[in-house]
């Protein structure tokens, strides 16, 4: 049934009315307003922006808009004792120092409170030693170094290029390899698109540009001092030694001009293959240490950042549902930025603002959604998804009982090529149907649907005539809702044609050059891609909040479960002898998937036929749909990751940004051939198969007829 059958609706107040009210010019205006000064988490400027958004959401017509504050652990550079890296000679004299700040972009020379580049939550320290180049510092890069090249990183300072995986995973890997410091840099191979000028003449990263970012390994914990519970006024806080996810070695980011000065002197082993070479005119030697003439020189880090418990503010707006006010559809995105936030997050926040305005306009004309819509402007996302996680921890009992869906709204663009969607399989059909009704903004697709341009430019690898939809990973505010609480979640943005560079971000990501002008001049001058993203995000929220029957299709979960079972089985079958020796069978998992498929099919048939005028039956069927995602939650969580509780999906243990399917089994199988106790290792594989099979079967049973 279409949305306009919801209660208290007139033909004027349907999805079309909501979408037609969204205006590109407003998004542009909001983006400008949100990007004129920095809005770093924990600062007065970001508090003032929170109050501004609260006030404007009230004006737009929401029923209530409240600030929710928490006191969480944040990290800042020392204003009088800057962080930098030196090359020192044999006498300990500093003969080269990296820059203390990024050259400011034109027009921003006099802006105060631009935080210099730093790695948030780095401990203090001044380690010195020989340098080892570790490529992207991925798990496989350290395997190559340690196992194939016999290079020991213990006691060394490692230099790694940004990209491919979340920076926190790089730091964790370096720690495990025994490094005593980490230098992160942006190589032009990953952050400079050929044929495009650097900012301010284009959207590429200049040599003095640096990517900021946190280097935590929180695994979904939220505030490092209050894992599992809100950082409120009466919170019990752990000591810093017991804090979750903090790095133990100093870390600092630099740009490629400074990196060149370090890398051009590298000696030792040659790079193992061309995949270890970037685009700088340096040998990309691995080390350890510098070559011939420079062999007595060392690298020294000077890190003086401090961790401080600081107040943060979420803005929570409510539009009460007319029929099911106790069912929540949430649209949330963060407000805090590293500097100006031209893309991250304000291109998303501007879209949320316009969506709120459009919903508010309808509400002022007498309309209400069927279900309650919650709008959130999260704080401290950049410091580890802290605002969203603390709020969800505080409201977990409500959310687990009432949460229908969460739609994330960080950066609206990371390119201007095509749509990118990551979501639960429950939302596949919603996304397909919605994009078929929206106009494509792409050149060459005038008069065609968004679905058509998206499918053409980003085809599904499995199903012809359908677009690619990816798994949810993490690195954004949906994490607590999906991975911890099991609330159906999705995200959408416009992306680049750069599939190989999926997790590196756009060139100016987290740099001072992420300005309003970057978006207005180079990415989306007409704000047509922003408008399309607003229509997708807003359209999903509208349907989720207004459809009489929730727009979830459980059959799509059945399809992916079979695909994921096949995939994990094929990984295990790389060890046929051990599977035989240790009697490892996937029969229980495949059986559970088969049962899920059959039960989901029958449920879908009943969903077509039931009496929708019976509010009790309607509510019952909707609850089965709502609680299906919840059924994949294991209350015990994944091994050593208690806040990642979803059995089907978790952030990859090797890359927080990427989603892994059947993560418990995957991690148990990972590098199993190197385990010292194979019997124990294969025993854990069997246990994880058991957990997965049980969970899939249990989830299937939630879709069975209730009596």
């Amino acid at each position: 049934k279409s949305s306009n059958e919801a209660t208290n609706i007139t033909p004027k107040h349907n999805m079309k009315a909501f979408l037609d009210e969204l205006k590109a010019e407003n998004i542009k205006k909001f983006l400008y307003n949100f990007t004129q000064i920095p809005h770093l988490a924990g600062t007065e400027q970001n508090f003032q922006l929170a109050k501004q958004i609260q006030s404007q959401w009230k004006e737009f017509g929401l029923d209530s808009v409240e600030l929710a504050h928490y006191d969480v652990l944040l990290s800042y550079p020392n204003k009088t004792h800057p962080n930098y890296i030196s090359i020192i000679n044999e006498d300990g004299n500093e003969i080269f120092n990296t820059s203390l700040f990024e050259p400011p972009p034109p027009g921003y020379e006099n802006v105060s409170d631009i935080v210099p580049p730093f790695s948030a939550f780095s401990p203090q320290g001044m380690p010195e030693g020989d340098l080892v180049y570790v490529n992207y510092a991925r798990t496989e890069d350290f395997f190559k170094l340690e196992r194939d090249m016999k290079i020991n990183c213990s006691g060394k300072i490692v230099i790694a290029r940004y990209g491919k995986v979340f920076r926190g995973n790089k730091v964790k890997n370096a720690q495990l390899a025994g490094a005593k410091g980490v230098i992160l840099y942006s190589d032009p191979a990953d952050y400079f698109a050929p044929g495009v000028k650097s900012y301010p003449d284009g959207w590429n990263l200049p040599g003095g540009g640096v990517q900021r970012g946190n280097i935590l390994n929180l695994n979904g914990a939220g505030d490092p001092l209050t894992p599992g519970y809100p950082a409120n006024e009466y919170a019990y806080r752990r000591g810093i030694a017991e804090a979750v996810g903090l790095p133990s070695i100093p870390v600092h980011p630099i740009g490629y001009y400074d990196a060149q000065k370090l890398l051009e002197k590298m000696g030792g082993s040659a790079p193992p293959d061309s995949s270890w070479r970037g685009s700088l005119k340096v040998p990309y030697n691995v080390g350890p240490g510098f070559t011939g003439n420079f062999s007595t020189q060392k690298v020294k880090m000077h890190i003086h950042s401090t961790n401080e418990v600081t107040r943060i503010y979420n803005v929570i707006g409510t539009l009460r549902g007319a029929v099911e006010p106790d069912r929540y559809v949430i649209l949330g995105g963060h407000r805090d930025s590293w500097v100006f936030g031209g893309i991250d997050p304000q291109s998303g926040a501007a879209v949320v603002h316009e969506i709120v305005r459009s919903f508010g306009t309808l509400k002022k004309e007498g309309w209400r959604p069927r279900r309650t819509i919650l709008f959130a402007s999260w704080d401290a996302e950049e410091f580890g998804l802290l605002g969203s996680t603390e709020w969800a921890e505080e409201n977990s009992r409500l959310l687990q009982e009432r949460g229908v869906a969460y739609i994330n709204a960080d950066s609206s663009i990371e390119g201007n090529y095509t749509l990118r969607v990551d979501c639960t399989p429950l939302m596949y059909s919603l996304v397909h149907n919605l994009t078929k009704e929206l106009k494509s903004p792409d050149e060459g697709f005038e008069g065609k649907s968004l679905y058509e341009s998206w499918t053409k430019k980003s085809p599904s690898p499995e199903f012809s005539g359908m677009p690619r939809i990816s798994k949810l990973g993490s690195g954004n505010d949906f994490e607590v809702f999906f991975q911890r609480l099991g609330i159906a979640s999705g995200r959408a943005r416009y992306t680049k044609n750069w599939e190989t560079n999926k997790f590196s971000g756009y060139p100016l990501y987290h740099s001072v050059y992420e300005t309003y002008e970057l978006v207005e001049k180079f990415y989306d001058p007409m704000f047509k891609y922003h408008l399309t993203v607003a229509q997708v995000r807003g359209g999903m929220v509208f349907e989720l909040a207004n459809s009489i029957v929730l727009p979830f299709d459980c059959r799509d979960y059945a399809v992916v479960l079979r695909k994921y079972a096949d995939k994990i089985y094929s990984i295990s079958m790389k060890h046929p002898q051990e599977m035989k020796t240790y009697s490892v069978s996937f029969d229980s998992l495949f059986s559970a998937v088969k049962n899920f498929t059959e039960i989901a099919s029958k449920f879908s048939e009943r969903l077509q036929d039931f009496d929708k005028s019976n509010p009790i039956v309607l509510r019952m069927m909707n609850d089965q749909l709502m609680f299906l995602e919840r059924a994949f939650i294991d209350p015990l969580g994944l091994p050593d990751r208690p806040f990642y509780r979803h059995v089907i999906y978790a952030p990859s243990s090797h890359n927080k940004y990427a989603g892994e399917s059947f993560p418990g089994i995957y991690d148990a199988l990972f590098d199993i051939e190197s385990k010292v106790d194979p019997s124990k290792a294969w025993g854990e594989v069997k246990r994880q198969i058991y957990v997965a099979a049980f969970t899939v079967q249990a989830a299937a049973e939630t879709l069975s007829e209730v009596a």
Partner: antibody, heavy 120, light 111 residues
Amino acid sequence: SVQLQQPGAALVRPGASVRLSCKASGYSFTYYWMNWVMQRPGQGLEWIGMIHPSDSETRLSQKFRDKATLTVDKSSSTVYMQLNSPTSDDSAVYYCARDGNFPYYALDYWGQGTSVTVSS
Amino acid sequence: DVVLTQAPLSLPVSLGDQASISCRSSQSLEYSNGNTYLHWYLQKPGQSPELLIYTVSNRFSGVPDRFSGSGSGTDFTLKIHRVEAEDLGVYFCSQSTHVPTFGGGTKLEIK
């Protein structure tokens, strides 16, 4: 805009060392190598050497090891080249030129050149 | 040092003609990262040299698209499609893969 300012001419006596200057503006001075290039009258271009303002690291062509000394003054964004024991053979136009770093690794901006005449 | 040999030494052309200049290197100019640091400069009469083409085929900003570079390894070519009066001067190839060197120059003049 990037500018490299050099004095137009210098007259020097044989054997009396001369210091040529090159004042940079319009960019982040410490990020880029500064090169010196010689051009004898009616001849081609010859690379002398380069200096990095951040740490004064110097690389000189083998041919000019004893002839040229490169220094930098970060406070004034100026690079200097001293010509030691000049002879008439050193009469030439001397250009400073910025190495454009990535993605160019070429001499993207040049000074106007200083014409050095070695004569008694 | 790497020797760059340019041909011809002098190239008389009529305005509107295509001009082609060759630059041959005594050793490969491909760097270990896969890039080739061979560049072209133009020195107009009485002026400093100016960068035209970097890394074999990329036009520097403001350089008209009638200039194009090509080649690999040890053999490189600069082409000027439809020569204009302002293109006259001496063209130098140069490499920065190894210790920097310049070619001897090719003088483009009116026929």
